[in-house]
């Protein structure tokens, strides 16, 4: 299957019940600290506020944050990272009323509470060290 360009930008319209599904494979061995980053932008430019940033350090930890009024806020982290070295993953980000629920290969790893309404999100960008198979939004 052909891969998508990385970074990959996708215009979106999110609401409660939406799900962003990302399928891909890390392109480096975990010993080289490959990363995956997903950003939920509130406009179509990269200077806009970010409702949700999800950055995976494969084999290590996940860092989440948000950029509000141009200011990065406090990071939230989890050490539960059920990705496998060299194997395809399916990352699903579900939009719930109070939070983004993040699942990897069907396993919940975190809930990131909304501080910016999901309806403000205009673009999802997927970037860093992955071969990207697909990105889709289910409403």
């Amino acid at each position: 299957m052909s891969s998508l360009p990385v970074p990959y930008k996708l215009p979106v319209s999110l609401s409660v019940g939406s799900c962003v599904i990302i399928k891909g494979t890390p392109i480096h061995s975990f010993i080289n600290d490959p990363q995956l980053q997903v950003d939920f932008y509130t406009d179509m430019d990269e200077d806009s506020d970010i409702a949700f940033r999800f950055r995976v350090h494969f084999g290590n930890h996940v860092v989440m944050n948000r950029r509000e009024f141009g200011i990065w806020m406090l990071e939230e982290t989890t050490d539960y990272v059920p990705f496998e070295d060299g194997k395809q993953f399916e990352l699903c980000i579900y939009v719930h009323y109070n939070e983004y629920e993040i699942k990897v290969n069907g396993i919940r790893i975190y809930g990131f509470v909304h501080r910016i309404p999901p309806s403000f999100v205009k673009m999802v960008q997927v970037s860093r060290d992955i071969s990207l198979t697909s990105v889709c939004v289910c409403n």
Partner: nanobody, 119 residues
Framework: EVQLQASGGGFVQPGGSLRLSCAAS????????MGWFRQAPGKEREFVSA?????????YYADSVKGRFTISRDNSKNTVYLQMNSLRAEDTATYYC???????????WGQGTQVTVSS
């Protein structure tokens, strides 16, 4: 439709206090980070302070107002407040409130409320 209404401004002498209010509606304002900005004549809009909907998140302040201004909110009333103490002449401006994620969308910002600090 997003609606934002700032109020509570006025004329005050240096060293005085004012409490601004921002009533928000038309979006999930009680679950949104809300911020205060100000704009003086001939100057660019300036960030003042922001507060998350979560009590566990610390508020943020511009260096110029730290220790003098306090932001708070009442989620049950969809209202955000800015308590301004030890006011200075340089605090003179029109004050606006806005949710995070909309800082560039001026049509949603309403009229703002004028604060004038002068002796």
């Amino acid at each position: 439709e997003v609606q934002l209404q700032a109020s509570g401004g006025g004329f005050v002498q240096p060293g005085g206090s004012l409490r601004l209010s921002c009533a928000a509606s038309g979006f999930g304002s009680n679950r949104s980070t809300m911020g205060w900005f100000r704009q003086a004549p001939g100057k660019e809009r300036e960030f003042v302070s922001a507060i998350s909907s979560l009590s566990s998140d610390p508020p943020y302040y511009a260096d110029s107002v730290k220790g003098r201004f306090t932001i708070s909110r009442d989620n049950s009333k969809n209202t955000v407040y800015l308590q301004m103490n030890s006011l200075r002449a340089e605090d003179t401006a029109t004050y606006y409130c806005a949710p995070a994620g909309m800082r560039g969308v001026m049509e949603y910002w309403g009229q703002g409320t004028q604060v004038t600090v002068s002796s």
